[in-house]
Amino acid sequence: ARNGDRCPLGPGRCCRLHTVHASLEDLGWADWVLSPREVQVTMCIGACPSQFREANMHAQIKMNLHRLKPDTVPAPCCVPASYNPMVLIQKTDTGVSLQTYDDLLAKDCHCV
Amino acid sequence: ARNGDRCPLGPGRCCRLHTVHASLEDLGWADWVLSPREVQVTMCIGACPSQFREANMHAQIKMNLHRLKPDTVPAPCCVPASYNPMVLIQKTDTGVSLQTYDDLLAKDCHCV
């Protein structure tokens, strides 16, 4: 089987972690978050060719059916396999508080 | 805010559970699975417009950045939120065995 981490489309074309620099305004958070003012958002971007970082059996099925019926079944999609937590300083009804979000920054990626 | 389960693109166009009828041959399993001969594969298919079945904060961020930078950041993607287990009767080196797979059939869907 092809190496599950080797991209057949060329370097950087397949599902992997990308970092996007974003302001509170970009994120739509300016009205409820005070800090940080800017976020290095890590997210999963890229193609999911056959056998590349397949998350599970479902991803294998989806790829096989996509090859058979590309108009009906989409290819697997590059999504977070896990997340890094992050704290936001946010405005609340009772004042300002520090809140930890566990599902904000992608930590690593796979194809589902 | 828009109802997270109401599809603004029209009925059935947004991320939801679909069933695809597939044979062992379709799935590429004919050489190692004996039963079932055919599978009703449940999978997640459909568009992920803003606020529709957003899985988490990461999905919200991704949508906001997609609207800002559509060429750089893809829209959230419709993937399984959970799975239904399924048993396969499979060929092994020592004969035939019953194996349960927990990640084979999508149970419900969300946008990530």
Epitope: L34, S35, N84, P85, V87 | -
Partner: antibody, heavy 118, light 107 residues
């Protein structure tokens, strides 16, 4: 809930090295944005920020003391350390550690007192 | 370093009064200022963040205002438990610096 507790030697002689430990619970220093600062306060006087360590091991020091300060962390055991070399009577103070999210100081320890005396 | 100056070391007030504690930064710090309350024998406690936002749980009689170089902490309807020292702090740039403190005395 979040708690922080400082510990130190209590008394040192001039020229010795001060080793302080901040033991905390209720949060993780592996969380993006989280950090711990050390601040000191001589008796009856104001507050002086000393050093800060971020979740990603980025460290910041007060330039007036930088050559004498070393901050470090052990994320797995929930501890942050501060070393101050060559202490003098001017270092006599109560030393606090405080949790920060980005630049938001929301929990402080009870403080540990250091007396430098020959 | 940015110097934070609290010109009044002591302020005397009565229960029910309104008092304003001021703080001046040696250069523009935007709204990157916090206020802390320290009661005798205790560690500091956050009151105000980003010049005007109360920490969660802080009574609404505490109000922060200002931007740039001039900042004010106002306590309306002063209570006896407000007997404490109040410090401003800038976090616009390193090193973080604190004001010298203003002790509030209750008559």
């Amino acid at each position: 809930q979040v708690t922080l507790k400082e510990s130190g030697p209590g008394i040192l002689q001039p020229s010795q090295t001060l080793s302080l430990t901040c033991s905390f619970s209720g949060f993780s220093l592996s969380t993006s944005g989280m950090g711990v600062s050390w601040i000191r306060q001589p008796s009856g006087k104001g507050l002086e920020w000393l050093a800060h360590i971020y979740w990603d091991d980025d460290k910041r020091y007060n330039p007036s003391l930088k050559s004498r300060l070393t901050i470090s962390k052990d994320t797995s055991s929930n501890r942050v350390f501060l070393k101050i070399t060559s202490v003098d009577t001017a270092d006599t103070a109560t030393y606090y550690c405080a949790r920060t999210g980005w630049d938001f100081f929301d929990y402080w320890g009870q403080g540990t007192t250091l007396t430098v005396s020959s | 370093d940015i110097v934070m100056t609290q010109s009044q070391k002591f302020m005397s007030t009565s229960v029910g009064d309104r008092v304003s504690v001021t703080c001046k930064a040696s250069q523009n710090v935007g709204t990157n200022v916090a206020w802390y309350q320290q009661k005798p024998g205790q560690s500091p406690k956050g009151l105000i963040y980003s010049a005007s936002y109360r920490y969660s749980g802080v009574p609404d009689r505490f109000t922060g205002s200002g931007s740039g170089t001039d900042f004010t902490l106002t306590i309306n309807n002063v209570q006896s438990e407000d007997l404490a020292e109040y410090f401003c702090q800038q976090y616009n740039s390193y090193p973080y610096t604190f004001g010298g403190g203003t002790k509030l005395e209750i008559k």
